[in-house]
């Protein structure tokens, strides 16, 4: 099967790397803009230059291309507790990322928001926390993990999963429900 | 078939409280984020609240921020949203969805109204 290919690829497959072919006329394959630039004009002819301007401030371009405007740069999003980590550049987007000892959740493949990294109190870290994962927590014995967080075996209820970590000491709080005095 | 239903919608005065409860089925329910979005009337879609398949992680717009709690039962395959101290422009249909910012799946929606 022959993948498909939409018109810009088709046109620019039949001129080679780091050309593409003229929009009004097939015959003529222009150069690439550099990173940094957009194309102003296309080449008048063969041999001829492109006209390629530069980015204004506020757009970048980060690859050879036949753009008509540069990309406008991404702003962090400070809802999502998002920091500037470099700066937009004629050739490069802004770079956003999470403050130190704060991990990425992402909620779609683009979206990422912050959040601390667990400190596993009552637990020891199992796995260190990274740009993408929040810590690994191991809990101590007599508390459970719930939400990543280790959480007293005393807050167990019967009906959640910790019955099996906690099952000891739901049993011995049984036991000493049952044993009234009289 | 992935299913989501919506229930716990009504109408309530300014100030009181609601919970809505979405039930899943049909996909990993444990494995997903899930959000609550609404649509008000002749507006668009509004990105609500989110939960992390564990539900460590949420996230709330900053309209409902302090006054709505998102949570999820993984055992029960149940999303749920409180809402407290609702005010008249909480008025809107609220759908529970998977995925963002696509929503592929989402329910029919329960619908809010905030009168007095």
């Known amino acids: 099967l022959v993948p498909h290919l939409g018109d810009r690829e088709k046109r620019d497959s039949v001129c080679p790397q780091g050309k593409y072919i003229h929009p009004q006329n097939n015959s003529i394959c222009c150069t690439k803009c550099h990173k940094g630039t957009y194309l102003y004009n296309d080449c008048p002819g063969p041999g001829q230059d492109t006209d390629c301007r530069e980015c204004e401030s506020g757009s970048f371009t980060a690859s050879e291309n036949h753009l008509r405007h540069c990309l406008s740069c991404s702003k962090c999003r400070k809802e999502m507790g998002q920091v500037e980590i470099s700066s937009c550049t004629v050739d490069r987007d802004t770079v956003c990322g999470c403050r130190k000892n704060q991990y990425r959740h992402y909620w779609s493949e683009n979206l990422f928001q912050c959040f601390n990294c667990s400190l596993c109190l009552n637990g020891t870290v199992h796995l260190s926390c990274q740009e993408k994962q929040n810590t690994v927590c191991t809990c101590h014995a007599g508390f459970f993990l719930r939400e990543n967080e280790c959480v007293s075996c005393s807050n167990c209820k019967k009906s959640l999963e910790c019955t099996k970590l906690c099952l000891p000491q739901i049993e011995n709080v049984k036991g000493t429900e049952d044993s009234g005095t009289t | 078939e992935v299913q989501l239903l919506e229930s716990g919608g009504g109408l309530v005065q300014p100030g009181g409280s609601l919970r809505l409860s979405c039930a899943a089925s049909?996909?990993?329910?444990?494995?997903?984020?899930m959000f609550w979005v609404r649509q008000a009337p002749g507006k668009g879609l509004e990105w609500v609240s989110a939960?992390?398949?564990?539900?460590?992680?949420?996230y709330y717009a900053d309209s409902v921020k302090g006054r709505f709690t998102i949570s999820r039962d993984n055992s029960k395959n149940t999303l749920y949203l409180q809402m407290n101290s609702l005010r008249a422009e909480d008025t809107a249909v609220y759908y529970c969805?998977?995925?963002?910012?696509?929503?592929?799946?989402w329910g029919q929606g329960t619908l809010v109204t905030v009168s007095s």
């Open positions: 969805a998977k995925r963002y910012p696509d929503f592929d799946y």
């Open positions: 049909g996909f990993t329910f444990d494995a997903y984020n």
């Open positions: 939960i992390s398949p564990s539900g460590r992680e949420t």
